[in-house]
Amino acid sequence: IPPHVPKSVNSDVMASDNGGAVKLPQLCKFCDVRLSTCDNQKSCMSNCSITAICEKPHEVCVAVWRKNDKNITLETVCHDPKLTYHGFTLEDAASPKCVMKEKKRAGETFFMCACNMEECNDYIIFSEEYTTSSPD
């Protein structure tokens, strides 16, 4: 970090490596909860037009797919992988792809994925074997 850039008081926000260059935050789809038409598919696009800069450099991209008697929703956000989301640990937070894993929730079907590549939560994958042929 050049001397004229003040050292941050908040070490969570000011992350740097040994070379002194400041670590960038991730860019993720961030539409919160939206109604979705994604159902019974091996993969889906988020159809979220908002790509946000995550608030902190260690946050990753997250997608949450939920289906109940009334509707299907897809949630896209940034989140700290050290913290739970909807009560669940973010698995595979270092993955370049957002591969959905089912979570046990009463009254709904609930899938969640996390990933750490730009806009990786724009393309959500429900089928593990599909990951090899998915676009970069």
Epitope: P2, D17, G19, A21, V22, K23, L24, P25, Q26, L27, I53, P57, H58, V60, A94, P96, N116, M117, E118
Partner: nanobody, 124 residues
């Protein structure tokens, strides 16, 4: 030598507007994603906005989305930040920064050059 020189900061009333500029030299401007980053007094860095080198695709922090507009003029090697509907919480030193080339992995993404910064004060 890489240089980034910001200008356009100053004192503005809440609800007012400012346009920041960042003149870049010493590297091929059209090859790099550029960022505006700010640091409020006593706070950490906040990544405000970014713009792709070609095609002008833009990204914003949720705190400024809809109020700030990033742009660039590749013919002038200049980066801009139009700030509207300014609030007291926008008070900060604003830096432009050049992203290092590399993969799209967070673990490998870094800034390697910064400007000196320009102070924006929003107060009545």
């Amino acid at each position: 030598e890489v240089q980034l020189l910001e200008s356009g900061g100053g004192l503005v009333q809440p609800g007012g507007s400012l346009r920041l500029s960042c003149a870049a030299s010493g590297f091929t401007f059209t090859e790099y994603r550029m960022w505006w980053v700010r640091q409020a007094p006593g706070k950490g860095l906040e990544w405000v906005s970014a713009i792709e080198p070609i095609g002008n695709r833009t990204y914003y922090a949720r705190s400024v989305d809809g109020r700030f507009t990033i742009s660039r003029d590749n013919s002038k090697n200049t980066l801009y930040l139009q700030m509207n509907s300014l609030r007291a919480e926008d008070t900060a030193v604003y830096y432009c920064a050049k992203q290092m080339p590399g993969q799209k992995w967070m673990a490998k993404s870094r800034f390697d050059y910064w400007g000196q910064g320009t102070l924006v004060t929003v107060s009545s």
